[in-house]
Amino acid sequence: PEPPTACREKQYLINSQCCSLCQPGQKLVSDCTEFTETECLPCGESEFLDTWNRETHCHQHKYCDPNLGLRVQQKGTSETDTICTCEEGWHCTSEACESCVLHRSCSPGFGVKQIATGVSDTICEPCPVGFFSNVSSAFEKCHPWTSCETKDLVVQQAGTNKTDVVCGPQDRLRA
């Protein structure tokens, strides 16, 4: 019979022969032959392979170095890498989450549009007319100006994006 030029899924071509790939969590020790199956061995400690493969070495797990602000979300197995996330108040600097930085705060005049997560930073927005923020915060949204009218008061000092309006009593007309 003609030697194969392509192999089935979960197989690979070597020496004009289709050999089985090693399953996730195992590495290749020796290719199959006419008489023997592919020989695979489990990955060792702190190692993984997450696909059907013909790798002779497993990949090393990541460690969630606390000096970089990281903590363990899910430890690695022979088939998966470790998943790291950031300590409270910090977020990953990249998709791979190799280190963390402190969440940024929104300055006075800006409010939090979206609170930071372990993987994304705080999103700030300028306080629009009618709203203000007088603090630097990673949580506070822009607050609406106080409505003087609903308190039977009048505006004595106009609000800004950083300050609330100042209300005062209405001038009473004397008879």
Partner: antibody, heavy 120, light 106 residues
């Protein structure tokens, strides 16, 4: 701060069993694999085996199969090593060593060791 | 099992001398860890994943190797380096240690 507190020294008679403990603080043992290592007097290090505390799965060096049993209790954050049918060959210091993924690198922390002396 | 042969078993070095300890594996391994142990104390990870120094380890230490051949080197021996050093592989279960190299100060 990561700390490992191993149980105290044991003097046991040949043929008896002993159960050693290793209580972790500063991390959750479910985020690690808990290993046990043996060191006989004036000798080198021997790996006994390890447990995944998250699911109880264990791996042993075949030469300790039947001699050693590793267990873990996640509620008390403690790993255990039980040694059975003790002989003078089991006289050694036993270390618990977490492979903790919240450390900067593998095997960053070792317990202080528990001395087991087998003598009649 | 993967057998690790360390050499020499025992050696002495003068202060300032270069030291090399080798670890030969019976089968190819992906990486090697090295541990330092002083009498009456628990071992400490000294070099991890072949060439990375653990925190607090002086820069005069180094690690290298691949496949079946690995080594730990000290560029200039110091008194505090006197200890027993063990290599350890984690690429295959059971995990195995070398028999150790006792390094003494001459």
């Amino acid at each position: 701060e990561v700390q490992l507190q191993q149980s105290g020294a044991e003097l046991v008679k040949p043929g008896a069993s002993v159960k050693l403990s290793c209580t972790a603080s500063g991390f959750n043992i479910k985020d690690s694999y808990m290993h046990w290592v043996k060191q006989r007097p004036e000798q080198g290090l021997e790996w006994i085996g390890r447990i995944d505390p998250a699911n109880g799965n264990t791996k042993y060096d075949p030469k300790f199969q039947g001699k050693a049993t590793i267990t873990a209790d996640t509620s008390s954050n403690t790993a255990y090593l039980q040694l059975s049918s003790l002989t003078s060959e089991d006289t050694a210091v036993y270390y618990c060593v977490p492979n903790y993924y919240g450390a900067a690198y593998p095997f960053a922390y070792w317990g202080q060791g528990t001395t087991v002396t087998v003598s009649s | 099992d993967i057998v690790l042969i360390q050499s020499p078993a025992i050696m002495s070095a003068s202060p300032g001398e270069k030291v090399t300890i080798t670890c030969s594996a019976s089968s190819s391994v992906s990486y090697m860890h090295w541990f330092q142990q002083k009498p009456g104390t628990s071992p400490k990870v000294w070099i991890y994943s072949t060439s990375n120094l653990a925190s607090g380890v002086p820069a005069r230490f180094g690690g290298s190797g691949s496949g079946t051949s690995y080594s730990l080197t000290i560029s200039r021996m110091e008194a505090e380096d006197a200890a027993t050093y063990y290599c350890q592989q984690g690429s295959s279960y059971p995990l195995t240690f070398g028999a150790g190299t006792k390094l003494e100060l001459k």
